[in-house]
């Protein structure tokens, strides 16, 4: 056959299906490939042609879509299963061509099991939610396209294994789930389970999100550094280990890039000659605010290294703040030991 | 059916205390919250606040922090609105309301009349 | 807070005109927006849920429309039990909040 260009096996696209239910899969090609879409190459005389690699095998084969109830179907750019079946895993290819023209891009499915709390491999979206923060939503997601707008499907929502009944906090309308006053205790997962008929026979879809309580942008400060502060001098002696640490609090911000770092005599460490190393933890709270720890480490301090600037910086999309180590050199203590116990009549 | 039954019309001095009852009927009580409406005279509606009737907690809306306490018997199906050092500005009818984020049922609504 | 407007304060119509009552948000509320008829001296009663939505007990003549922060009751040939008041209220955020109501009147 002729040349096409192949955009290869798009892993990005790791499509995941629940098995028996249905499943709508648009070709990629149009969505992150070509400039244009599926009606324009439709109108220019160009065809999408669909097949399939089984698991674990090698050989290409045609999509059969002649089976019964047209379990799996084409329309217009959606590859349909109506509804899928376990053996349906593989790769798939959508290719567009025409005599002049041909290009083509393979995605994985994989059509996963689930038990009866909902419990399967699939990766799940995670949705954050602010604590305390007012009435809250989450959607029941990705079941567009699925029935007509009228078709009036019946939606049940569950929290883990349990259809939520109790509505003082949470409650389930339609497509949506609101969170009246979102806590701790909210986390977890929610899964929807969307039923509709079509054709006189009735499908479902099931859609599990994690819900993750966060902190509120009402209550989020500007980093706070909780060390150094002025109460801890590092006191060290020539040739003595001098380690100080930088500890940072930010609040959860969404989006929000936290950032720590030194700067020595106003220099970042890696622009001077001194031998520092900069080791870094972080830790998490459960709304996941930030503690970011660095702690500057000289292994053999001297006596001008004693006389720098050690500032620890942070920045987030609150501000930037930074502050200052108290760094002296100790002072030998004077050696009259002997002197003052004889002075005191020791023997 | 469901019915949220308030207590009957209070006629109260400035600086007393009133206790409203709602009680509840018809459905599983400690799966809605229950909010409290204020009406004054010829007015409009205006939300007082809620309790959570599974934990008890409330939450009462800024105008209603002071002197205002809600409250449940949950073996009674019953939620109260208690008001402290009654003012004139008091008189008004208070309704009790299951939500479900619009509310669905409504108590009949209890008056209460503040006069010295 | 979110401020709910609701206008004319009185409409004065006759029985089987059909009017439109309408209640703004100060600020998008999505479809966040119920309805409630009320008779003098007796406690509110739910019409139109999330904008749109019907009521099941309530006459088909009630209707409602709109999302984000214009929002309109619609009455199909008024009858003599709706002369009443008719409040809005909103479910995006806390605290909720009602209009100031409509009073529909006989003209």
């Known amino acids: 056959s002729e040349r096409c260009d192949d955009w290869g096996l798009d892993t990005m696209r790791q499509i995941q299906v629940f098995e028996d239910e249905p499943a709508r899969i648009k070709c990629p090609l149009f969505e992150h490939f070509l400039k244009f879409n599926y009606s324009t190459a439709h109108s220019a005389g160009l065809t999408l042609i669909w097949y399939w690699t089984r698991q674990d095998r090698d050989l290409e084969e045609p999509i059969n879509f002649r089976l019964p109830e047209n379990r799996i179907s084409k329309e217009k750019d959606v590859l349909w299963f109506r509804p899928t079946l376990l053996n349906d895993t593989g790769n798939y290819t959508c290719m567009l061509r025409n005599t002049t023209y041909c290009s083509k891009v393979a995605f994985p499915l994989e059509v996963v099991q689930k038990d009866s709390c909902f419990n399967s491999p699939m990766k799940l979206p995670v949705h954050k939610l602010y604590i305390e923060y007012g009435i809250q939503r989450i959607t029941c997601p990705n079941v567009d396209g699925y029935f007509p707008s009228s078709v009036k499907p019946t939606i049940t929502w569950y929290m883990g294994c349990y259809k939520i009944q109790n509505f003082n906090n949470v409650i389930p309308e339609g497509m949506n789930l609101s969170f009246l006053i979102a806590l701790i205790s909210n986390n977890g997962n929610y899964t929807c389970v969307v039923t509709y008929p079509e054709n006189g026979r009735t499908f479902h879809l099931t859609r599990t999100l994690t819900v993750k309580v966060v902190g509120s942008p009402k209550n989020a400060v500007p980093p706070v550094i909780h060390s150094p502060n002025d109460h801890v001098v590092y006191e060290k002696e020539p040739g003595e280990e001098l380690l100080i640490p930088c500890t940072v609090y930010f609040s959860f911000l969404m989006d929000s890039r936290n950032e720590v770092w030194w700067t020595i005599d106003g220099k970042k460490p890696d622009d001077i000659t001194i031998d520092v190393t900069i080791n870094e933890s972080i830790s998490h709270s459960r709304t996941e605010d930030e503690t970011r720890t660095q702690i500057l480490s000289i292994k053999k301090v001297t006596s001008e290294d004693l006389k720098r600037s050690y500032v620890c910086h942070a920045r987030s999309a609150k501000g930037e703040v930074a502050k200052a180590a108290k760094v002296k050199q100790k002072v030998p203590a004077p050696r009259y030991t002997v002197e003052l116990a004889c002075g005191f009549g020791a023997t | 059916q469901i019915q949220l039954v308030q207590s009957g019309p209070e006629l109260k001095k400035p600086g007393e205390t009133v206790n409203i009852s709602c009680k509840a009927s018809?459905?599983?009580?400690?799966?809605?919250?229950m909010h409290w409406v204020k009406q004054a005279p010829g007015k409009g509606l205006q939300w007082m606040g809620w309790?959570?009737?599974?934990?008890?907690?409330?939450t009462y809306a800024d105008d209603f922090e002071a002197r205002f306490a809600f409250s449940l018997a949950t073996s009674a199906n019953t939620a109260y609105l208690k008001i402290n050092n009654l003012k004139n500005e008091d008189t008004a009818t208070y309704f009790c309301a299951r939500f479900f984020l619009h509310f669905d049922y409504w108590g009949q609504g209890t008056t209460l009349t503040v006069s010295s | 807070d979110i401020v709910l407007t609701q206008s004319p304060a009185t409409l004065s119509v006759t029985p089987g005109d059909s009017v439109s009552l309408s209640c703004r948000a100060s600020q998008s509320i999505n479809n966040d927006l119920h309805w409630y008829q009320q008779k003098s001296h007796e406690s509110p009663r739910l019409l139109i849920k999330y904008a749109s939505q019907s009521i099941s007990g309530i006459p088909s003549r009630f209707s409602g429309s709109g999302s984000g922060t214009d929002f309109t009751l619609r009455i199909n040939s008024v009858e003599t039990e709706d002369f009443r008041m008719y409040f809005c209220q909103q479910s995006n955020n806390w605290p909720l909040t009602f209009g100031a109501g409509t009073k529909l009147e006989v003209k």
């Open positions: 018809g459905y599983t009580f400690t799966d809605f919250s």
């Open positions: 309790i959570n009737t599974e934990t008890g907690e409330p």
